[in-house]
């Protein structure tokens, strides 16, 4: 149950300008998850550019089961996780662990969800209860977004946290534990 598979399946994304995701459900986000800063690699010499279209980031494919209470999806769903720093396309490796790593020193960019898709899932429940259907919104593509001066420090933290983990649903956890970490496409930082 939970994370069934992780495919280290990176795709380079060269995003378009001026596209924004649909406003997400208004729930809070606890910003407590850790992430690896810069992948542990030393920063490459910064490359200054004003054009977001010159930047790219990776899409990682995750396969997981979704749940609701005691019920679990009959089949796993596959979604994207927007991962890593945004860097000039020509410097960003196309697969993890290969090539040079770049870290911006000037404008601040983040790899964030761009488009979402809704997937209808069938959940199987214990005790002979009828299966139930749900619609989960999954990240369909990622993009680099340049942070403006209007984004404050807490919003910068949101970007970092969100970029490093799945966008919907998590491994089932004890009932009363915080679900805030589930709410990944949240806040208006996007």
């Amino acid at each position: 149950q939970g994370w069934q598979a992780f495919k280290n399946d990176a795709t380079e994304i060269i995003p378009e300008l001026g596209e924004y995701p649909e406003p997400p459900p208004e729930l809070e986000n606890n910003k407590t998850m850790n992430r690896a800063e810069n992948g542990g690699r030393p920063p490459h010499h910064p490359f200054e550019t004003k054009d977001v279209s010159e930047y790219s980031c990776r899409e990682l494919h995750f396969t997981r089961y979704v749940t609701d209470g005691p019920c679990r999806s009959a089949k796993p769903v596959t979604e994207l996780v927007c991962s890593g720093q945004c860097g000039p396309a020509r410097l960003l490796p196309n697969a993890i662990g290969r090539g040079k790593w770049w870290r911006p020193s000037g404008p601040d960019f983040r790899c964030i969800p761009d488009r979402y898709r809704a997937q209808r899932v069938q959940l199987l429940c214990p005790g002979g209860e009828a299966p139930r259907a749900r619609k989960v919104r999954l990240v369909a593509s990622c993009k680099c977004k340049r942070l403006t001066r209007f984004h404050n420090q807490s919003e910068l933290k949101d970007f970092g946290t969100e970029a490093a983990r799945p966008q919907k649903g998590r491994k089932p956890r004890p009932r009363a534990r915080s679900a805030k970490a589930n709410q990944a496409e949240l806040e208006n930082a996007y």
Partner: antibody
Framework: EVQLVQSGAEVKKPGASVKVSCKAS????????IHWVRQAPGQGLEWIGR????????EFAPKFPGKVTMTTDTSISTAYMELSRLRSDDTAVYYC??????????????WGQGTLVTVSS | DIQLTQSPSFLSASVGDRVTITCRAS?????IHWYQQKPGKAPKLLIY???NLASGVPSRFSGSGSGTEFTLTISSLQPEDFATYYC?????????FGGGTKVEIK
């Protein structure tokens, strides 16, 4: 901005039917289930059922099949709930709400403003 | 069906009071949500998945519980908190709401 805007109040006679609308904006209605909940005067909330705007499939609370018809017109992002054979105890405020599901939990962050249906002879 | 019983049904309290509302389920459930409703308005999501604050909800609201007993706590009641509160479950079909707790000014 996500919004659900419902049609105005209705006064109907017993035995008649009424159709309440719920217009969605700020999101694609096909991506979410739309639920209907009612509240009789001075009473609590009662779930009626839900509709999948993408394919028209419906689910009802046990007491409502045959009484309620839920439909959608995705071309105008609107969900409808029709109540037939109205009785005085159908007098209530009817709400639509959007079901959100994150892969672990299901909840209703967005609600319409409500439509008062009064059944009186 | 899972019945949700809220207690008390009515509660008189003063500004600044600590208020606790209980929601008991007739069978064990995984989580509940809490909604606040003011007269003439639609319900507003307050706490989701037992213990998580919805956006824009003040931190004086908190939720806890598991199994068959869940609580909503308002640590210091404010004038705008006088309203009716509902719990809701969908761990088991059909979806059900509690009967509501009306918080009135003492």
């Amino acid at each position: 901005e996500v919004q659900l805007v419902q049609s105005g109040a209705e006064v109907k006679k017993p035995g008649a039917s009424v159709k309440v609308s719920c217009k969605a904006s700020g999101f694609d209605i096909k991506d979410y289930y739309i639920h209907w909940v009612r509240q009789a005067p001075g009473q609590g909330l009662e779930w009626i059922g839900r509709v999948d705007p993408d394919n028209g499939e419906t689910e009802f609370a046990p007491k409502f099949p045959g009484k309620v018809t839920m439909t959608t017109d995705t071309s105008i992002s609107t969900a409808y709930m029709e109540l037939s054979r109205l009785r005085s105890d159908d007098t209530a405020v009817y709400y639509c709400a959007r079901e959100d599901y994150d892969g672990t939990y299901t909840w209703f962050p967005y609600w319409g403003q409500g439509t008062l249906v009064t059944v009186s002879s | 069906d899972i019945q949700l019983t809220q207690s008390p049904s009515f509660l008189s309290a003063s500004v600044g009071d600590r208020v606790t509302i209980t929601c008991r389920a007739s069978s064990s459930i995984s989580y509940i949500h809490w909604y606040q409703q003011k007269p003439g308005k639609a319900p507003k999501l307050l706490i989701y998945a037992t213990s998580n604050l919805a956006s824009g909800v003040p931190s004086r609201f908190s939720g806890s519980g598991s199994g068959t007993e869940f609580t909503l706590t308002i640590s210091s009641l404010q004038p705008e908190d006088f309203a009716t509160y509902y719990c809701q479950q969908w761990s088991s079909d059909p979806l059900t709401f509690g009967g509501g707790t009306k918080v009135e000014i003492k």
